[in-house]
């Protein structure tokens, strides 16, 4: 399975929407900065079978969807932008699920790399814990928005490799 060109476009649109979602200057939130420990090694893609890379990307997008579809998120971000954001994430999840289905039986390796998926979950668990500790403050959400934008940018490299991989 090769991810369609529309998947890359959707990823770029997702980043644009997240950029538009910013409401306060990041510079006013410098004291709230936090290292969430983005698992870069899970997105390098060199050691991956294709199906496993797809499952890791799927988990990251699913967790992003979960994070931004809470009532605390809805109270923070512009509703129109959030709806657009959900649409793009949903499109990407569908693309990856379609790809996953095609990969079943193609590779001898398991479809899901559970260990890699759990590493992604731990990363998102840290983000949700941070938001809880900061009582979902505007600056905390701003820090998280910037972090998710960064993680999407970093994962885009893996998506691009998947799209080109024969």
């Amino acid at each position: 399975c090769d991810l369609p060109q529309t998947h890359s476009l959707s990823n770029r649109r997702t980043l644009m929407i997240m950029a538009q979602m910013g409401r306060i200057s990041p510079f006013s939130c410098l004291k709230d900065r936090h290292d969430f420990g983005f698992p870069q090694e899970e997105f390098d893609g060199n050691q991956f079978q294709k199906a496993q890379a797809i499952s890791v990307l799927h988990e990251m997008i699913q967790q992003t969807f979960n994070l931004f579809s809470t009532k605390d998120s809805s109270a923070t971000w512009d509703e129109t932008l959030l709806d657009k954001f959900y649409t793009e994430l949903y499109q990407q999840l569908n693309d990856l699920e379609a790809c996953m289905m095609q990969e079943v039986g193609v590779e001898d390796t398991p479809l899901m790399n559970v260990d890699s998926i759990l590493t992604v979950r731990k990363y998102f668990q840290r983000i949700t814990l941070y938001l809880t500790e900061k009582k979902y403050s505007p600056c905390a959400w701003e820090v998280v928005r910037a972090e998710i934008m960064r993680s999407f940018s970093l994962s885009a490299n893996l998506q691009e490799r998947l799209r080109r991989k024969e």
């Epitope: 420990g37 988990e59 814990l129």
Partner: antibody, heavy 122, light 107 residues
């Protein structure tokens, strides 16, 4: 097969230091949280602390913070629990546990070590 | 801290009986309830996670239900192996907390 193998029993005097270990095998060490749980003989279970072996990020139960410390050695897939000055009240069985994390980010303890008995007595 | 209160603290039953243990949380923990069994001299073992999901390898005579502030563990057709102490746990908020335990012994 997932295994968490703990060191044997320890008998110590109050004020002494101690480090107990939990050697894990059978899975990717850096992908799962590890916690320590205390059980005072004949009593219930108390969660103490958890660590992400990937980068040693830790979360402590405030009741134990400052009295114990958790650490990992990735090269030998081992987690440690350490005291710098033991008290008689530290007498207990200590279990290391592996966390599983569901998609909705619910932690639960899916594998337990066999426990290490620590006896602190003068 | 979220307090977890189990009832009863102890109960007696016979092989083949059914028993129910209840756990109440001092505030809502959603479905972040888990149940463990501890046999004498052994480490606890996971039975049920996320209130109602049976851990792999655990017999179907164990069932969990509930969410919010209350959950229950039901054991049908008790086996000799089931006479042990049962603990509920919440992982919704830090610090994670356990119930005080329910000791199930032979009548």
């Amino acid at each position: 097969e997932v295994q968490l193998v703990q060191a044997g029993a320890e008998v110590k005097a109050p004020g002494e230091s101690l480090r107990i270990s939990c050697k894990v095998s059978g899975y990717t060490f850096t992908s799962y949280w590890i916690s320590w749980v205390r059980q005072i003989p004949g009593k219930g279970l108390e969660w103490m602390v958890k660590i992400d072996p990937r980068d040693s990020y830790t979360i402590y139960n405030p009741s134990f913070q400052g009295h114990v410390s958790i650490s990992v050695d990735k090269s030998i897939t081992t987690v440690y629990l350490q005291w710098s000055s033991l008290q008689a009240s530290d007498t207990a069985i200590y279990y290391c546990v592996r966390h599983y994390l569901t998609q909705s980010l619910v932690d639960y303890f899916d594998h337990w070590g066999q426990g290490t008995l620590v006896a602190v007595s003068s | 801290d979220i307090q977890m209160t189990q009832s009863p603290s102890s109960l007696s039953a016979s092989v083949g009986d059914s028993v129910t243990i209840t756990c109440r949380a001092s505030q809502s923990v959603s479905n972040y309830f888990h149940w463990y069994r501890q046999k004498p001299g052994k480490a606890p073992e996971l039975l049920i996670y996320s209130a109602s999901n049976l851990q792999t390898g655990v017999p179907s005579r164990f069932t969990g239900s509930g969410s919010g502030t209350e959950c229950t563990l039901t054991i049908t057709s008790l086996q000799p192996d089931d006479f042990a102490t049962y603990y509920c746990q919440q992982t919704h908020g830090y610090p994670f907390t356990f119930g005080q335990g329910t000791k199930l012994d032979v009548r």
